[in-house]
Interface confidence: low
């Protein structure tokens, strides 16, 4: 088992290293509907938490330039061209941007208003808008660059419930599983292992940039020939899992402690826990608010 | 020098519904840096603390009054204002408005307080 | 919601004296703790924020410590202008309950 001890935690790095973009980059073409992903889980049903999407950067406090803004039973302000496709009385609040030009790039902020202060979860996505090309755009609307499905799991609630984003439909995506024990440490760090708040949060990585995914080819062969002669088959190249790794691997990685400038997870210390058979979960402390969504999901306390 | 001034009828009668205003002055009311709140005071008692809302209108209100209470802004003028429905002799009260706000993550708690003012409830 | 309790409710003292204050939250808070001071007749005014962080303007024989649930504040050399009641406050959660007061007086 120990011997699996340096490439896992490599691998691991690697994983980190690719996801630590400043912003993830969601594109549309001129004319078509832009898509930016937003989730949280109500802690019951109908028990929503208000949400805003403004353009620009989140602020300190709300959003800047309101576009669309849902409170604890509907959708209250919207205005035109801006809507929310999927159900956010489930917790999709997912924006779609009808009909996009050329000035709707730019920065969206998409504002989980959880109850508490600075519990609020801030996530900065940037809508890059590309010119309408000559020949026919395909008949899809979503033309965006990371599609993230998502997975979610409070503490003691048992196995986690998995919902997938068919946008990339034949791309396998990788599957790290997190628990979150802080959301941020701003300089009055709140503790929401104290007030029992403690949320695991369920990261997909999407394989969708350019240079991602051929990063991800070369690393696919890499664990092809690593693995080839082990039991599990990778079938797909574009393929990292970690969900057959031994959980030393994680150990040994969470010994370092990873950190990203823009995206900084701490990895703790002795923390890993076997949730079900051949899938390792690790423990992950989010020091500060991560800048891109990273397709999560908030399973709220 | 941000100042804080509440108004609105002092006696109330029960059932009725409390509305008292609070006017901001000498401050950014529309900044995204404050939220704003009302606190109430029963005589010779402590401090209960009603609700707040932040600039662009989200609201959170006490879980105990929160099926009658209402807080709304009213940008135009720097007022935000408070409504308590179905009141009863228990609402008697001094009522602060106040003002909170955030130094980059640090959260400022109310530094800026109205003088108050007492609402009876009465028949 | 979260409770906050005070201790003790009524604190004689006499000019000089150094006084503490205790402040016990119902569930962790962090540092999300504030102190306020309210005369007879008077708004709150804000003493301490983050538990520990003087308010511009208040003299520094006020101090605040603590983190987690229990809390205190600290008046070095009492002075007559400090008898009053002190108030804690959380905002670690909504709603943002304060403690039921600490009333300190001319023994």
């Known amino acids: 088992m120990f011997s699996h001890l340096p490439f896992d935690c490599v691998l691991l790095l690697l994983l980190l290293l690719l996801t630590r973009s400043s912003e993830v980059e969601y594109r549309a073409e001129v004319g078509q509907n832009a898509y930016l992903p937003c989730f949280y889980t109500p802690a019951a049903p109908g028990n929503l938490v208000p949400v805003c999407w403004g353009k620009g950067a989140c602020p300190v406090f709300e959003c800047g330039n309101v576009v669309l803004r849902t409170d604890e039973r509907d959708v209250n302000y919207w205005t035109s061209r801006y809507w929310l496709n999927g159900d956010f009385r489930k917790g999709d609040v997912s924006l779609t941007i009808e009909n996009v030009t050329l000035a709707d790039s730019g920065i969206y902020c998409c504002r989980i208003q959880i109850p508490g202060i600075m519990n609020d979860e801030k996530f900065n996505l940037k809508l890059v808008i590309k010119p309408a090309k000559v020949t026919p755009a395909p008949t899809r609307q979503r033309d965006f660059t990371a599609a993230f499905p998502r997975m979610l799991t409070t503490r003691g609630h048992g196995p986690a419930e998995t919902q997938t984003l068919g946008s990339l439909p034949d791309i396998n995506l990788t599957q790290i599983s997190t628990l979150a024990n802080e959301l941020r440490d701003s300089r009055l760090a709140n503790d929401l292992r104290d007030s029992g708040a403690t949320i695991r949060i369920g990261i997909y990585i999407g394989a969708g940039i350019c240079a991602g995914l051929a990063l991800a080819l070369i690393f696919g062969a890499l664990i092809f020939k690593w693995y080839s002669h082990s039991k599990e088959k990778i079938q797909n190249l574009s393929l990292i899992s970690l969900a057959n790794l031994p959980p030393s691997g994680l150990a040994n990685a969470v010994a370092e402690g990873i950190r990203s400038e823009e995206n900084i997870y701490t990895i703790e210390e002795n923390v890993y826990e076997v949730e079900e058979p051949n899938e390792y979960y690790c423990y992950v402390s989010s020091r500060q608010q991560p800048s891109q969504p990273l397709g999560c999901r908030f399973a709220m306390p | 020098q941000v100042q804080l001034q509440e108004s609105g009828p002092g006696l109330v009668k029960p059932s009725e519904t409390l509305s008292l205003t609070c006017t901001v002055s000498?401050?950014?009311?529309?900044?995204?840096?404050?939220?704003w709140g009302w606190i109430r005071q029963p005589p010779g008692k402590g401090l209960e603390w009603i609700g707040i809302f932040y600039y662009s209108g989200t609201t959170y209100y006490n879980p105990s009054l929160k099926s009658r209470v209402t807080i709304s802004a009213h940008t135009s003028k720097s007022q935000f204002s408070l409504k308590l429905s179905s009141v009863t002799a228990a609402d008697t009260a001094v009522y602060y408005c106040a003002r909170g706000g955030e130094y980059f993550d640090r959260l400022l708690p109310f530094d800026y307080w109205g003088q108050g003012t007492l609402v009876t409830v009465s028949s | 919601e979260i409770v906050m309790t005070q201790s003790p409710s009524f604190l004689s003292a006499s000019v000089g004296d150094r006084v503490t204050i205790t402040c016990r939250a119902s569930?962790?808070?962090?540092?999300?703790l504030a102190w306020y001071q309210q005369k007879p007749g008077k708004a709150p005014k804000l003493l301490i924020y983050?538990?520990?962080t003087l308010e511009s303007g208040v003299p520094s024989r006020f101090s605040g410590s603590g983190s987690g649930t229990e809390f205190t504040l600290t008046i070095s050399s009492l002075q007559p202008e400090d008898f009053a009641t002190y108030y804690c406050?959380?905002?670690?959660?909504?709603?943002?309950?304060f403690g039921p007061g600490t009333k300190v007086d001319i023994k």
């Open positions: 000498g401050g950014s009311f529309s900044s995204s840096s404050y939220y």
């Open positions: 406050q959380q905002l670690n959660s909504y709603p943002f309950t």
């Open positions: 983050a538990a520990s």
């Open positions: 569930q962790g808070i962090s540092s999300y």
